[in-house]
């Protein structure tokens, strides 16, 4: 912590200006009004203070506003938005989409995912929900950003808003992720035709149930391996040699690339090695012939 | 050991039919489509079609679709490519090979002469 | 039916270079071709499949790259064993055609 002094007459700052470069960081705490510098904060950022020098500027703001910075502060952070913690971010309240970009910016080619993620909590929490305009800001700015919410912020996006979303937009989305914008998805692209409906449900698929996976399996889609690696393990497992094959169509030949991997390697292990035989692919592991399968968890669920 | 073994060498008169044959061992022969490629002196390699042990699908190129013939023996273990009507362009050495491409047999010369 | 136009059709190189051989498919086969090399009098060897998996026993210094339509194989510091003719093949459906061949000669 700055030690506290009292400001040279000579030091003491009436506005925030370039001068203030040469000023030691207990000078900046002795000689800089909390509140002038909240109302000066659009001249910060051009000023080529030393990281030092920020952290004393953020001491101040962070004394003047204990509950969290008001919007006008935010929106002029710059570069102090890099000495931010996601503790610090958790206390404001942000729902101007210029604040958003110009934070997003900032923070570009800085280790910072954590504090992004929390800023665009806070934006959807301050906007009531995750709308069009926020969702356009998010992929033009930070791809990959939409996948740093919770799924529970992730369940106010309307349906209407998912068309908006991009392929790349959804690669670092988790399961739960996916299971709460799949559904919204099928809402949002039902009146497509087959094929234009699965070029766009594809990105959400890691999110869709069995009987959705089974239904794509009877429209020849031909699904890349790729997107069925990100299927869910539940959703795959209930699938026949039959369905699977004419799920992949022709990228069934990937299923050998990947016989060692979930969710491919606990599919075979549940298929007739008779019925893996089918494909030709040379896959292995699959219940022997001759063997009985007992379903134990049907005498389970009715005990 | 796991190999794919074929006669080395067939010699057949012009119009004549023959039937090449691939015995699979040290491996799963149902669970692998097996492959025919074919391969004239000097010149690159041609897929001519592949059968699959197991259903007995076969997939042919439309190019010797009229004239090939793919087959299999299970309970041998053997694969059977017969050609018919055979003319000069026949003559080449014949591959099998099994799907995954790990696997290719020694190549039968087939030589059609009178 | 898929078309694989592959190039340079032949290419002489000495022992310790680097080459590169490329395969250009007629249309998107994602990452299924695989590279074969092929010694006079001799059955093809398979050397990657899956664009740039290693088939078990062959060389590192052999490595595939590529998707979709576009694929290379480069082999570094080239071994006296190394020449010969080198083919890709697609393996997305059938008909499963092959490019032309790349023979490898010494310089």
């Known amino acids: 912590d700055v030690e506290r002094t009292t400001c040279p007459p000579e030091k003491e700052v009436h506005e925030i200006d370039e001068s203030l470069i040469f000023y030691k960081k207990r000078e900046l705490e002795a000689c800089v009004d909390a509140a002038l510098l909240a109302a000066q904060m659009d001249r910060v950022d051009a000023i080529p203070f030393t990281y030092e020098q920020l952290d004393v500027l953020k001491h101040k703001l962070d004394e003047l506003y204990p509950q969290g910075y008001p919007e006008s502060v935010i929106r002029h952070l710059g570069h102090l938005f890099l000495k931010m913690s996601p503790e610090d971010i958790r206390k404001w309240n942000v729902t101007s989409l210029e604040t958003l970009k110009a934070l997003l910016k900032v923070s570009k080619g800085h280790e910072m995912s954590a504090q992004v993620a929390t800023l665009i909590d806070r934006v959807v929490v301050g906007r009531g929900q995750l709308d069009k305009d926020t969702v356009d800001t998010l992929t033009a700015f930070c791809p990959g950003c939409l996948c740093s919410l919770s799924p529970e912020r992730l369940s106010s996006v309307p349906p209407s808003v998912i068309g908006a979303v991009r392929p790349q937009d959804l690669d670092t989305c988790g399961p739960r992720q996916l299971d709460v914008l799949y559904p919204k998805a099928r809402l949002a692209f039902q009146n497509m035709s087959g094929s234009e409906y699965f070029v766009k449900i594809r990105p959400f698929l890691g999110g869709a149930p069995t009987e959705d996976v089974k239904a794509l399996s009877q429209q020849n889609v031909s699904m890349d391996l790729a997107t069925f690696m990100k299927l869910r393990r539940e959703a795959v497992l209930p699938l026949t040699v039959a369905e699977v094959q004419k799920l992949l169509g022709p990228h069934v030949e990937g299923l050998k690339v990947e016989e060692q991997h979930s969710p491919v390697r606990d599919w075979i292990l549940k298929q007739r090695q008779d019925d893996l035989d089918t494909l030709g692919l040379g896959l292995q592991g699959g219940i022997p012939n001759g063997y009985l399968i007992l379903d134990l968890s049907v005498r389970e669920a009715l005990s | 050991q796991v190999q794919l073994q074929q006669p080395g060498t067939e010699l057949v008169k012009p119009g004549a039919s023959v039937r090449l044959s691939c015995r699979a061992s040290?491996?799963?022969?149902?669970?692998?489509?097996m492959h025919w490629v074919k391969q004239r002196p000097g010149q690159g390699l041609e897929w001519l079609g592949n059968?699959?042990?197991?259903?007995?699908?076969?997939n042919y190129n439309e190019k010797f679709r009229n004239r090939a013939t793919l087959a299999v023996d299970k309970s041998s273990t053997t694969a059977y490519l017969q050609l018919t009507s055979l003319t000069s362009e026949d003559s080449a050495v014949y591959f099998c090979?099994?799907?995954?491409?790990?696997?290719w047999g020694q190549g039968t010369t087939l030589t059609v002469s009178s | 039916d898929i078309q694989m136009t592959q190039s340079p059709a032949s290419l002489s190189a000495s022992v310790g270079e680097t080459v590169t051989i490329t395969c250009r498919a007629s249309e998107n086969i994602y990452s299924y071709l695989a590279w074969y090399q092929q010694k006079q009098g001799k059955s093809p060897q398979l050397l990657v499949y899956y664009a740039k998996t290693l088939a078990e026993g062959v060389s590192s210094r052999f490595s595939g790259s590529g998707s979709g339509t576009q694929f290379s194989l480069k082999i570094n510091s080239l071994q006296p064993e190394d020449f010969g003719t080198y083919y890709c093949?697609?393996?997305?459906?059938?008909?499963?055609?092959f490019g032309g061949g790349t023979k490898l000669e010494i310089r």
């Open positions: 040290g491996y799963s022969f149902s669970s692998y489509w």
């Open positions: 090979v099994r799907h995954d491409g790990f696997l």
């Open positions: 093949q697609h393996q997305f459906g059938t008909p499963r055609t």
């Open positions: 059968i699959n042990p197991t259903t007995g699908d076969i």
